[in-house]
């Protein structure tokens, strides 16, 4: 079948990195600069992806493979093949259309991306708060009072005072 196909279609003999040039009697011509063909038998080469601005080049384009981009520091990749770059925030913040904003009281974010999430409610598991939460860290739940040995006491630190200027977004 392969032999039959190549007799019928000379383009099938063109390897990756070339294209079947109709203007030159279907001769296999190398892909022009800034273009590539990743499979054989192609009638055109694809334009290389350009990594500029918010994108930077992770892998250069070659005649047989497209360029690969990642994001300039300060931003991180989103989507398949890093199709978008999204701004980093500090821990204790989340990204909004107004830029990076501090987590509201009672929420935290321990990463440079993603949203602020509510602190764990220790009492739902019958436990007490061992370490208070912050904008950057979740609370740490301790053992429930019932788990404590007789005579021991559970010291629950007071809840932190509401910080000024951290009204809900």
């Amino acid at each position: 079948f392969e032999r039959t196909r190549s007799l019928q279609d000379p383009c099938s003999n063109c390897p990756a990195g070339t294209f079947c040039d109709n203007n030159r009697n279907q001769i296999c011509s190398p892909c022009p600069p800034n273009s590539f063909s990743s499979a054989g038998g192609q009638r055109t080469c694809d334009i290389c992806r350009q990594c500029k601005g918010v994108f930077r080049t992770r892998k250069e384009c070659s005649s047989t493979s497209n360029a690969e981009c990642d994001c300039t520091p300060g931003f991180h990749c989103l989507g398949a093949g890093c199709s978008m770059c999204e701004q980093d925030c500090k821990q204790g913040q989340e990204l909004t259309k107004k830029g990076c904003k501090d987590c509201c009281f009672g929420t935290f974010n321990d990463q440079k991306r993603g949203i602020c999430r509510p602190w764990t409610n220790c009492s739902l598991d019958g436990k007490s708060v061992l370490v208070n939460g912050t904008k950057e860290r979740d609370v740490v739940c301790g053992p429930s009072p019932a788990d404590l040995s007789p005579g021991a006491s559970s010291v629950t630190p007071p809840a932190p005072a509401r910080e000024p200027g951290h009204s809900p977004q």
Epitope: L78, S83, E86, K97
Partner: nanobody, 123 residues
Framework: EVQLVESGGGLVQPGGSLRLSCAAS?????NYWMNWVRQAPGKGLEW???????????YYVDSVKGRFTISRDNAKNSLYLQMSSLRAEDTAVYFC????????????????SGQGTTVTVSS
């Protein structure tokens, strides 16, 4: 081909003004949120401002509030950044960038940006 081309950068004295422009081609500007971001020498990329499709929403990083104004002319497929009261710390390469499909709903990712225009603030 989808393209953004910035212009208008240059050397300006502290306290001076500049207006950056960004010409969009290959897509309809009025369908997208648009952004300006900048990269100071030796620093990471910093988001500066954004504007929604019809220009009714505009947001700025704290350090430029009251000094920079983002605007757009959808009929001319152009985005602008008016910069006044410029400071040495505004020295950077400025890029315009398109908010990707779903910007402001699912994410705040930028999917297209230009080559940038250089702004130098120095006496």
């Amino acid at each position: 081909e989808v393209q953004l081309v910035e212009s208008g950068g240059g050397l300006v004295q502290p306290g001076g003004s500049l207006r950056l422009s960004c010409a969009a081609s290959g897509f309809t500007l009025s369908n997208y949120w648009m952004n300006w971001v900048r990269q100071a020498p030796g620093k990471g990329l910093e988001w500066v401002a954004n504007i929604n499709q019809d220009g009714s929403e505009r947001y700025y990083v704290d350090s430029v509030k009251g000094r920079f104004t983002i605007s757009r002319d959808n009929a001319k497929n152009s985005l602008y950044l008016q910069m006044s009261s410029l400071r040495a710390e505004d020295t950077a390469v400025y890029f315009c960038a398109r908010g990707g499909e779903g910007y402001g709903v699912d994410h705040y990712g930028l999917d297209v940006s230009g080559q940038g225009t250089t702004v130098t603030v120095s006496s």
